[in-house]
Interface confidence: low
């Protein structure tokens, strides 16, 4: 049986070497000489020769300093043989434990640790964690028992101890109120890790803490008073630019300004934000009316896109907006005036008065009237009063100038502002009909063939309106009925049929036709009839001398 006491060997021993560790014995040595040997790691396998054994005495020796952090345990096998070389014992496993010395400093896992914390964070808020390791034995010794401390804080403001570190875990937390990104955006901590629970070997690392932004600063108007001018009647005109400063992080929702007009019930103004520099651009949302109000005093508040994180006073500005008077065109009342007038209205008489109002009530301007479009030259206007009279006879049946019984004239009113302004009104004269047109035949030139002539239809035209038109009455006069007959072609008597009573010689004839309208207005018209050398429907005729009263006139 083997007699092997527990074996441990401190690392980093000084020597001299070899140095006795323990004496191995087999109780077979009572029976005869026993020779000892060892095998295994550190004996006959790498690292070879770290351990040796005195062949005859069994003293196990170490030949060099050990390094626990390289090999913490050696497993060897002891062998015992008799003088003839026969084994007297089965091999025995020997465990050699290398005991730890505090020969390793803690080492941080990073040279620089980065963390962040929101400004205004309350004490107890966790910021970040730093971690260090130690190669020494942390099971049986305190050689790797690391304690963390903060050695320094830069800047030491507003308090030199803004943060604390958990000695055991390395978690850094806020310990003091007053973190303010706008004052101190970063903190640099030098942190230490020391073994032996803080009493041993130590090392340092840097923890950089970024203080992140919250909306703890309001946008502030600078200046707080503005003036601007804007011409009346113009929308979307820039009046002035409002300037704000915000200490929060630029181009973030905590910095971006939102402008509100506090006293713009009519929605006449709007403030937009310039995304580049956060300025407020005050514009008109709709045209302003100088005659109603010449000055606006606006109160504008500014906040941020996101709510304030703390209780903050909202900055306000006063903007005085002066409305500038613009010379506005006179306005006709109504813009289009309809007047009914008989077409036989007397020349030189006043038809109507058509006037304009001056929007620029303060200016007490004089308005001058003139006719701008009067295609038939029928009208004239009093330049001071706007009274419109006839200068010539009206004619409803002047179809070049009158459409649907309506004559359209354009009137302009010009003020004496600077610059002058001109307004336009439309005058519609609705011309009522007078029976001033007798019926006329259409066509007036008619062709017949000498042989087998075909009757011809003649339409009766009257430019007037009912009841000054059909039914018409037709009558041949001046002896025309001797050679010709007429009869009505339709119940309304708006056309007649003309045909010869007998065969006629080739030549030209004149027929007098009297036509009368429903109101007995009549007119005699001469029809020019050509009898042609043809049969049936008339073709092209040679010219001949006319024949009066339907009788041929000798050449």
């Amino acid at each position: 049986d083997w007699v092997i006491p527990p074996i441990s060997c401190p690392e980093n021993e000084k020597g001299p070497f070899p140095k006795n560790l323990v004496q191995i014995k087999s109780n077979k040595d009572k029976e005869g000489k026993v020779f000892y040997s060892i095998t295994g790691q550190g004996a006959d396998t790498p690292p070879v020769g770290v351990f040796i054994i005195e062949r005859e005495t069994g003293w196990l020796k170490v030949t060099e300093p050990l390094d626990r952090e390289r090999i913490a345990t050696y497993t060897l096998f002891s062998h015992a043989v008799s003088s003839n070389g026969n084994a007297v014992e089965d091999p025995m496993e020997i465990l050699i434990t290398v005991t730890d010395q505090n020969d390793n400093k803690p080492e941080f896992t990073q040279e620089v640790f980065k963390g962040s914390v929101m400004e205004g964070a309350l004490p107890g808020t966790s910021v970040m964690e730093v971690t260090a390791t130690d190669a020494d034995d942390d099971v049986n010794t305190y050689n790797a028992a690391i304690a963390y401390t903060i050695l320094s804080q830069d800047p030491e403001l507003p308090d030199k101890n803004m943060f604390t570190i958990n000695r055991n875990t390395g978690v850094i937390s806020v310990v003091t109120t007053g973190l303010d990104r706008e004052s101190f955006p970063t903190y640099t901590l030098v942190v230490q890790a020391a073994d032996l629970q803080g009493e041993g070997l130590s090392t340092t690392a840097t923890a950089v803490i970024t203080v992140t932004d919250t909306n703890d600063n309001p946008p502030i108007f600078n200046p707080t008073t503005y003036k601007g001018q804007v011409p009346e009647n113009e929308a979307n005109v820039v009046i002035t630019t409002l300037k704000v400063t915000d200490a929060d992080a630029p181009n973030t929702p905590a910095w971006e300004a939102v402008y509100t007009i506090l006293n713009d019930d009519g929605g006449q103004f709007v403030v937009t934000t310039n995304p580049v520099n956060n300025d407020g651009i005050l514009k008109t949302a709709k045209g302003l009316d100088f005659e109603a109000k010449q000055q606006y005093i606006l109160h504008v508040a500014v906040t941020n896109v996101v709510p304030f994180e703390v209780s903050l006073t909202t900055s306000t500005a006063t903007v005085t907006v002066d409305v500038l008077d613009v010379n506005e065109a006179p306005i006709f009342v109504p813009p289009e005036k309809r007047v009914e007038v008989s077409e036989d209205f007397g020349v030189g008489q006043e038809i109507t008065s058509y006037t304009a109002q001056e929007p620029d009530t303060f200016m007490e301007q004089k308005i001058t009237y003139r006719i701008w479009r009067d295609t038939a030259n029928w009208l004239e206007i009093n330049p001071d009063t706007g009274a419109i009279s006839t200068r010539a006879e009206l004619d409803r049946e002047d179809f070049e100038h009158v459409k649907n019984s309506t004559y359209t004239a354009l009137i302009i009113a010009t003020d004496n502002g600077s610059p002058v302004a001109t307004g336009t009104g439309t005058l519609l004269l609705i011309l009522s009909d007078v029976n001033d047109n007798a019926p006329i035949p259409e066509p007036r030139t008619i062709f017949f063939c000498e042989r087998n002539p075909k009757p011809q239809v003649i339409n009766i035209i009257d430019a007037d309106l009912p009841p000054n038109t059909s039914p018409f009455t037709a009558e041949l006069t001046h002896g025309a009925s001797a050679n010709w007959t007429i009869q009505y072609n339709d119940p309304t008597q708006e056309s007649i049929i003309l045909k010869p009573k007998m065969a006629l010689e080739v030549g030209d004839y004149k027929i007098n036709l009297k036509l009368m309208d429903n109101q007995n207005k009549d007119q005699v018209t001469t029809l020019e009839v050509s009898v042609c050398d043809c049969e049936g429907a008339a073709g092209v005729c040679r010219k001949a001398q006319p024949v009066e009263a339907g009788l041929q006139i000798p050449a």
């Epitope: 008073t225 003036k227 109603a292 109000k293 006063t318 409305v323």
Partner: antibody, heavy 123, light 113 residues
Amino acid sequence: QVQLKESGPGLVAPSQSLSITCTVSGFSLSRYSVQWVRQPPGKGLEWLGMIWGGGSTDYNSGLKSRLTISKDNSKSQVFLKMNSLQTDDTAMYFCARTQFYYGHDGGYAMDFWGQGTSVTVSS
Amino acid sequence: DIVMSQSPSSLAVSVGEKVTMSCKSSQSLLYSNNQKNYLAWYQQKPGQSPKLLIYWASTRESGVPDRFTGSGSGTDFTLTISSVKAEDLAVYYCHQYYTSPYTFGGGTNLEIK
């Protein structure tokens, strides 16, 4: 000629309301704005507010919650009403016409004033 | 609000003397768009309502004697009476109409010796 004349109650009890009428002649209220100014005894002038020709109003922000200015163009009258009077509202109250400029460069001084009406707040 | 400060608060002069009184505003009353100063001067005689003397800092109101002159720009303004008459006994107020609320100075009381 242009004239403005204020008429008021003279004596008002604390916490009560004050109503003053300014009757004008010689100009149209639809065209000119009217301002109100007061003067405590032995003290300086304080601007109260104004009403524009179109009827809109502007007020001294410190008094806005207690002040109402209105008018009746057809009667040529402007009205000032002030609520919750205290003793420090004791003053002479003036109405005044605002200057007008053709082409208007903005900004308004007061070219015609009423003679004022004395208001005493006392129980 | 714009604060208007007048000095002196009171002064006594003899008839015929030249008088100047000062008015300072807490911010500029000069509007860059039209280069006008939004300041007026009023005269208030004892027992009377105020009377407009000067507007736009230097423009005399119609009917005001030419011995009254307004000057200055920005924040510093002066009313000068070139030769005081007995009838000029009054309190003189400056008034800004640059922005609402319109405000007045505390007044300068002109007494005649």
